[in-house]
């Protein structure tokens, strides 16, 4: 071993360096001292450090560590925060477009149903937004409410427009009859299936992104233990006490220290990996009826079809309802009277065709690819931090926590540190409570993501079966579940091109019954020119 270089006889260099950390020189000895009171930088000879300096070094070391950790996660944090915001806004835009498409359909095809229809449509899409953002609403209740509200208006305005005002008290009877007589056929169930599946996946996707932010924020603001502070001080600052200002810590030594300091954080790694892979599975399954963009933008067509279905059955319905609601004042129960089967339109529903440019779908896949480059983020953190702080290359002529060495030996360093600090002990302490909490949250979201990603056994399918979902309605892989038939295919060109349009706000006013509605014109919904041409079956 080379003899240590002679210490600075006056501690001048140490004084000038320390002054940058702590203005004033009262804590720095003018000449080397025995340092018998030191607890971290245990001297092998005279030292230029005092106990107060050591404390300041420890505080600075912990702050340095926190800053290094924050800069290590900055890119990942920005990636998730930015995408969570972009997707939330994009989903809101999809909901607004879907609302405007639906209002436009009513205005063009059923002007007599407005403004009531606008009000009900507005309330329905408000519920959709609330659901996506995490509110505890039952999707079936939402859809039922839409059709419960629409039917009395459809009946009194379209099917039986001659009803006198005094007959409007039959609204309550009509509301009940809507379900009893299945006046919209299986369309409400179809919409329930589509909307519940697509929205549940959308909601969990947003929840997962927001949890990702929470994970990074938690590890970003970890307060490192005093034991870690001592190890960091020994690695970064104890060399100064010997006047070795230009010496860098050995790379191997840095890795050992960082692994000790970050033992708790690294425990997140397993669950973080699973989080990214589960999120990828979820995203891969977000198509057809699991893609809210596809489902919501096609809703206007399915609702249009459902009203056409009512109109086709108008004759039988009017007769049945005439009997059922003749004395609506006395009707205090759900009707047990069921008519013979109504006419059922067997026409196959066609798929809404999408010419993808930069849709939400492609943006989701792009996010996953970027996230996957951070899959080893937590396991790689110790190495990353060492590579972004001053360490000696090739572990030659470097500081091992006690002295300047020609070559770093992990075994020697461990033996030398035995009396000062036990690395193994630090690892055995387990993660901080906040880390344990975030691991629990990751486990929970991973379970949800896995459940949602099972292609045939999604939670929603089971729930729908319990609700009595009929086999003839719409299965997972049936394309016809996407959109209604209308007068042929709905061709949505450049479906959202949403990045370019994110700031483009369609709605003048989100209040129900808004008078400034989108107006389809010349077979195009002109309000949506920035989205490309939306060819709709609305006449």
């Amino acid at each position: 071993q080379p003899p240590p270089p002679p210490p600075d006889a006056t501690c001048h260099q140490v004084r000038s360096f320390f002054q940058r950390l702590q203005p004033g020189l009262k804590w720095v000895p003018e000449t080397p001292v025995p340092g018998s009171d030191l607890q971290v930088c245990l001297p092998k000879g005279p030292t230029c450090c005092s106990r107060k300096m050591e404390e300041k070094y420890q505080l600075t070391a912990r702050l340095n560590m926190e800053q290094l950790l924050q800069s290590a996660s900055m890119e990942l944090k920005f990636l998730i925060i930015q995408n969570a915001a972009v997707f939330q806004e994009a989903f809101e835009i999809v909901v607004r477009h879907a609302k405007n498409y639906t209002n436009a359909m009513f205005k063009n095809n059923y002007p007599s149903l407005t403004p009531q229809a606008f009000e009900f449509v507005g309330e329905f899409f408000t519920d959709v937004s609330l659901y996506i953002l995490g509110s505890d609403i039952n999707v079936d209740d939402m859809v039922n409410e839409l059709f419960d509200s629409l039917f009395p208006v459809i009946y009194t305005q379209l099917m039986n427009p001659g009803l006198p005002d005094s007959a409007l008290d039959i609204n309550e009877c009509l509301r009940g009859a809507r379900r009893d007589l299945k006046v919209f056929g299986n369309f409400p169930k179809l919409i329930m299936t589509q909307v519940s599946k697509s929205l549940q996946v959308t909601r969990i996707f947003l929840q997962a992104l927001n949890l990702g932010i929470e994970v990074i924020n938690t590890t970003d603001h970890l307060k490192f233990s005093k034991d870690c502070g001592r190890m960091l001080t020994r690695m970064w600052y104890c060399s100064y006490c010997q006047g070795l200002m230009m010496v860098k810590p050995c790379g191997g030594y840095c890795n050992v220290v960082m692994q000790g300091c970050m033992a708790g954080v690294v425990e997140i790694d397993k669950y973080w990996r699973e989080y990214i892979l589960s999120l990828e599975e979820l995203v891969n399954g977000m198509y057809r009826i699991y893609d809210m963009e596809n489902v919501l933008l096609g809703l206007f067509s399915t609702i249009h079809d459902s009203i056409q279905y009512v109109q086709k059955n108008a004759g039988k319905l009017t007769t049945t309802i005439g009997k059922l609601c003749a004395h609506s004042q006395q009707r205090q129960y759900r009707s047990a009277y069921y008519p013979e089967d109504l006419f059922i339109d067997k026409k196959v529903l066609k798929v809404a065709h999408v010419e993808h440019e930069e849709t939400l779908s492609s943006r989701r896949r792009e996010l996953i690819q970027k996230l996957k480059s951070f899959i080893s983020f937590y396991s790689a953190l110790p190495g990353y931090i060492c590579s972004h702080s001053p360490v000696a290359e090739n572990d030659t002529l470097c500081w091992n926590g006690q002295e300047l060495v020609e070559r770093y030996s992990q075994k020697a360093a461990r033996n030398g540190m035995k009396n000062q600090f036990n690395l193994h002990e630090l690892k055995m302490k387990g993660p901080e409570p906040v880390v344990s909490q975030i691991i629990d949250k990751l486990k929970h979201i991973n379970q949800l993501l896995r459940t949602m990603s099972m292609p045939k056994g999604r939670v929603l399918d089971k729930n729908l079966d319990e609700e009595g979902f009929e086999s003839g309605d719409c299965g997972d892989d049936e394309d016809e579940c996407i959109g209604g038939s209308g007068d042929g295919m709905i061709k949505v060109k450049n479906q959202l091109r949403f990045l370019a349009e994110l700031a483009y706000d369609l709605d003048v006013d989100d209040a129900p019954g808004n008078s400034q509605q989108a107006t389809p014109k010349d077979n195009e919904i002109s309000t949506f020119h920035n989205l490309g041409n939306v060819h709709s079956p609305l006449k």
Epitope: E119, E123, N138, R175, P512, G513
Partner: antibody, heavy 121, light 110 residues
Framework: QVQLQESGGGLVQPGRSLRLSCAAS????????MAWVRQAPGKGLEWVSE????????YYADSVKGRFTISRDNSKNTLYLQMNSLRAEDTAVYYC??????????????WGQGTLVTVSS | QSALTQPPSASGSPGQSVTISCTGT?????????VSWYQQYPGKAPKLLIY???NRPSGVPDRFSGSKSGTSASLAITGLQAEDGADYYC??????????FGGGTKVTVL
């Protein structure tokens, strides 16, 4: 005509239980969300609980969560509020209210006349 | 959940106008959520005046109008009449779908 009629109120000792009922008539009960709202003497309105039309979702004010349970029987057109571990501060007129919509709380367009619950030893 | 903020009282002479404000937060009034207004006479059940921020149920005079902007809503009563003397409550719901009422405003017709 549309009507809500509460019953079950009265004087009860702290810590005891009470069950309120609300009989609905004149509307299709099973398609609307329903709620309980209370008003302490000389005070403002305080929402207590809400239940969706199907009964699949229930919502509670923090002040009653864990003590009160809302439920409905759509076949009987009846709304219930089971109140356990009653406290003096639960003393109020309890109104049964019909929501305009079925999915969740929005606006209450029909109200009962209220039933007085007094919690006192 | 905390109550929406309303002024405790407001007054006006017959024929004049009165506006009652209702202030909430971004998670109730300021969100997607709608605001409703109720009128209550002493010893009586409340009556719905406005729903969905600005819609009037049938039977409510058009002297009553509602509006919402940001985290605030307001009820305007024009052409004040003696029978408008009552308590008025605003109501909304938060992101957890829990209903929240305002503290109430007593309107006095001078």
């Amino acid at each position: 005509q549309v009507q809500l009629q509460e019953s079950g109120g009265g004087l009860v000792q702290p810590g005891r239980s009470l069950r309120l009922s609300c009989a609905a008539s004149g509307f299709t009960f099973s398609t609307y969300a329903m709620a309980w709202v209370r008003q302490a003497p000389g005070k403002g309105l305080e929402w207590v609980s809400e239940i969706s039309s199907s009964g699949s979702r229930t919502y509670y004010a923090d002040s009653v969560k864990g003590r009160f349970t809302i439920s409905r029987d759509n076949s009987k057109n009846t709304l219930y509020l089971q109140m356990n571990s009653l406290r003096a501060e639960d003393t109020a007129v309890y109104y049964c209210a019909k929501d305009r919509r079925g999915s969740h709380a929005d606006a209450f367009d029909v109200w009962g006349q209220g039933t007085l619950v007094t919690v006192s030893s | 959940q905390s109550a929406l903020t309303q002024p405790p009282s407001a007054s006006g002479s017959p024929g004049q106008s009165v506006t009652i404000s209702c202030t909430g937060t971004s998670s109730d009034v300021g969100g997607y959520n709608y605001v409703s207004w109720y009128q209550q006479y002493p010893g009586k059940a409340p009556k719905l005046l406005i729903y969905g921020n600005s819609n009037r149920p049938s039977g409510v005079p058009d002297r009553f109008s509602g509006s919402k902007s940001g985290t605030s809503a307001s009820l305007a009563i024009t052409g004040l009449q003696a029978e408008d003397g009552a308590d008025y409550y605003c109501q909304s719901y938060d992101s957890s779908l829990r209903v929240v009422f305002g503290g109430g405003t007593k309107v006095t017709v001078l």
